[in-house]
């Protein structure tokens, strides 16, 4: 028995910063869960983690080097994540497992979401014009 | 309170098995994973691999991963570890410990410890 | 693998000394380091997680810092309980590795 995800097929990151949601078919609601959300076809960069506990307020963490949030509803989690660069843009997945009550449960790999990270423009300064036109 | 109790010393020739058990207590088996971590006499630590109870999934030690055999019944919360093909050089104490699953970076609660001797 | 390297691997010292261990992991591991306590004959005591958190019912004596490759314990005035041999360890990424240790010994 597996829970299914759903999420955005494609986000723009414009300012460096996205919502990642995770929507599941499972209530979170007094369980104890580990959501995660993963880098790469091969999920093969475990980015940002979720601990939630009945009894404990939301742990969130990244043992990887990015700076993420995470927010709980009853059947989501949402990832928001910070500081992008435009080279990981890349399709990220979402990971959810049940750990408490028995038995176990995990999810049916999702389809993803192809975060795609836009480098910031930056626009000529005023005292540094660029070359004038003849 | 929260316990790992280890099975007693073993005696081996080399060439031969060890099954090292692990009975966890006092706290929810499946929101941890337990660890093996071996010790040579005068040595320092070294880390086998882990087992997590909930769905079986295993890391290994690229060293031990032809040798080493992680398992659990989580119905008597116990979890075992099994070393093949023994050599005189693993002659050790073998440490089970935990790990908590969502919070995974650090060992809390530790067994006592089995001496394993392997000798001719 | 990530190699941990502890130093010095042995010091001597007298109670009421401070004593610092330092250890250096061969990559990043930002904040992702954890002390241990062994004892002759005993299984390793969690001293610190997270580079700078004390385990419950450990002694303010002992303190952690450092992130990214480079970390110190500190115990601020040595005890007689506490000689003993110190570990690091990493808690980053699978394998999850030791340093090979620190002998506090009495002076």
């Known amino acids: 028995n597996k829970i299914l995800v759903k999420q955005s097929p494609m986000l723009v990151a414009y300012d460096n910063a996205v919502n990642l949601s995770c929507k599941y078919s499972y209530n979170l609601f007094s369980r104890e869960f580990r959501a995660s959300l993963h880098k790469g076809l091969d999920s093969a960069v475990e980015v940002c983690v979720v601990y939630g506990n009945y009894s404990q307020q939301l742990q969130v963490y990244s043992k990887t080097g990015f700076n993420c949030d995470g927010k709980l509803g009853n059947e989501s989690v949402t990832f928001y994540l910070q500081n992008l660069y435009v080279n990981q843009t890349d399709i990220y997945f979402c990971k959810i497992e049940v750990m408490y009550p028995p038995p176990y449960l995990d999810n049916e790999k999702s389809n993803g979401t192809i975060i795609h990270v836009k480098g910031k423009h930056l626009c000529p300064s005023p005292l540094f014009p660029g070359p004038s036109k003849p | 309170q929260v316990q790992l109790v280890q099975s007693g010393a073993e005696v081996k020739k080399p060439g031969a098995s060890v099954k090292v058990s692990c009975k966890a207590s006092g706290y929810t088996f499946t929101s941890y994973y337990i660890h093996w971590v071996r010790q040579a006499p005068g040595q320092g630590l070294e880390w086998i691999g882990c087992?997590?109870?909930?769905?079986?999934?295993?890391n290994y030690n690229e060293k031990f991963k032809d040798r080493a055999t992680l398992t659990v019944d989580t119905s008597i919360s116990t979890a075992y570890m099994e070393l093949s093909r023994l050599r005189s050089d693993d002659t050790a104490v073998y440490f089970c410990?935990?790990?908590?699953?969502?919070?995974?970076?650090?060992?809390?609660?530790w067994g006592q410890g089995t001496t394993v001797t392997v000798s001719s | 693998d990530i190699q941990m390297t502890q130093s010095p691997s042995s010091l001597s010292a007298s109670v009421g000394d401070r004593v610092t261990i330092t250890c250096h992991a061969s990559?990043?591991?930002?904040?992702?380091l954890n002390w241990y306590q062994q004892k002759p004959g005993k299984a390793p005591k969690l001293l610190i997680y997270k580079a700078s958190n004390l385990h419950t019912g450990v002694p303010s004596r002992f303190s952690g810092s450092g992130s990214g490759t480079d970390f110190t314990l500190t115990i601020s005035s040595l005890q007689p309980e506490d000689f003993a041999t110190y570990y690091c360890q990493q808690g980053q990424t699978y394998p999850y590795t030791f340093g090979g240790g620190t002998k506090v010994e009495i002076k």
């Open positions: 087992i997590y109870p909930g769905n079986v999934n295993t």
């Open positions: 410990t935990r790990s908590h699953y969502g919070l995974d970076w650090n060992f809390d609660v």
């Open positions: 990559q990043n591991i930002y904040v992702w």
